[in-house]
């Protein structure tokens, strides 16, 4: 009778279904929706995340102006194709053969199309651009506070090592927090700065993706931090491909 | 990149033996723990053997024990599972996997494609 058997649940990924069946009675998790082996050390990839949540019952500032190419996921849910590693398939396709291709967060970033539609790989989003509006407090949260806060939550709570957080930018109510990492950045072992954004995103949300832990408790030199809007804009290494008629929509 | 290539699988009457290798490459083979884990038609996947890096300490699921052997040669890249006594229920696509274990938990982060045992008489 081991630890494992006691506590056999994954610390950071509640949307599985664990087991003391690996060796030596160890604790062994799978996701739902795939029942793809997962690593409860780490974040899991969004990917299987997405898959496991559809298959459970259910001008001079210092703030950045998100390029002309970067993308908003506009397109809501669906139930990903991941790969045998847990990342997106670069092309994802509905029950009605509608196939469109994703980057490496699983966002489009084509026109639509049907089961003839290619997409060569899959490109990687190497900036993220994470911009949150919080409610009114009594003043301005300090700059330098607010940066040390948001960056200690990347790397304690989504163990996003800090060289990724590129910057924390604020002007009231506005907070831009900017994630980058290209492929050849990021090592074997290093979170990706899309999962990190996704547990990010699901934990303002009051969705927390942790297991058994509280929801997010942001504070400020004690004063709580509450969000009221989140917008991510996701940047590809390789511009998307849309048409003008999307484009002038 | 991480490639895992298995061979040996077939046919075999109960009672038969077989024995799988696991041909590894893209990765530091001689650090790494490995696994043979099974999916039986219409069923999950199931851990069946586990061998730590260098070879000193193997686990094995219920159902094997006692019939089942793995081992590893280190010069060689390979992962090998010596298969004995086979009965019908041993029927699946046998896949190697690169592994890791904690204290308290296991888990596989790269499988072969896998090849395919049919216990049958």
């Known amino acids: 009778h081991t630890a494992a058997q006691d506590n056999c649940t994954c610390p950071t990924n509640k949307m599985t279904v664990c087991s003391p069946d690996g060796p030596g009675g160890r604790c062994q998790c799978r996701a739902l929706g795939s029942g793809m082996a997962v690593d409860c050390s780490t974040l899991t990839s969004k990917c299987l995340l997405l898959k496991a949540r559809m298959s459970a019952p259910k001008n001079a500032r210092t703030l950045v102006r998100p390029s002309e190419h970067a993308l908003v996921d506009n397109d809501g849910l669906y139930d990903p194709d991941c790969d045998p590693e847990g990342r997106f398939k670069a092309r994802q396709c509905n029950q009605t053969s509608v196939c469109w291709c994703v980057n490496s967060v699983g966002v489009r970033r084509t026109d639509k199309g049907d089961l003839s539609l290619r997409c060569d790989e899959l490109v990687r989003t190497h900036h993220i651009l994470i911009d949150l509006r919080h409610r009114p407090t009594a003043g301005a949260f300090n700059h330098s506070d607010l940066d040390a806060e948001l960056r200690r939550l990347f790397r304690e709570r989504y163990r996003l090592h800090p060289k990724f957080v590129a910057a924390v930018h604020y002007e009231q109510p506005t907070i831009q927090i900017e994630l980058r990492q290209n492929t050849s950045q990021k090592a074997a072992g290093d979170v990706d700065i899309g999962d990190a954004a996704y547990y990010f995103e699901r934990d303002i949300k009051g969705e927390s993706l942790f297991q058994g832990r509280g929801g997010l408790d942001l504070r400020v030199r004690g004063e709580p931090l509450q969000v009221e809007r989140t917008l991510i804009y996701y940047l590809d290494e390789i511009p998307p491909k849309f048409s003008m008629k999307r484009l002038t929509a | 990149q991480v490639q895992l290539q298995e061979s040996g699988g077939g046919l075999v009457q109960p009672g038969g033996s077989l024995r799988l290798s696991c041909a590894a490459s893209g990765f530091p083979f001689s650090s790494a723990d490995m696994s043979w884990v099974r999916q039986a038609p219409g069923k999950g996947p199931e851990w069946v053997s586990y061998?730590?890096?260098?070879?000193?300490?193997?686990y094995y699921a219920d159902t094997v024990k006692g019939r089942f052997t793995i081992s590893r040669d280190n010069s060689k890249n390979t992962l090998y599972l010596q298969m004995n006594s086979l009965r019908a229920e041993d029927t699946a696509v046998y896949r190697c996997?690169?592994?890791?274990?904690?204290?308290?938990?296991?888990?596989?982060?790269?499988w072969g494609q896998g090849t395919m045992v049919t216990v049958s008489s």
């Open positions: 061998i730590n890096a260098d070879g000193s300490k193997t």
């Open positions: 996997a690169r592994a890791k274990l904690t204290d308290t938990h296991y888990v596989e982060d790269y």
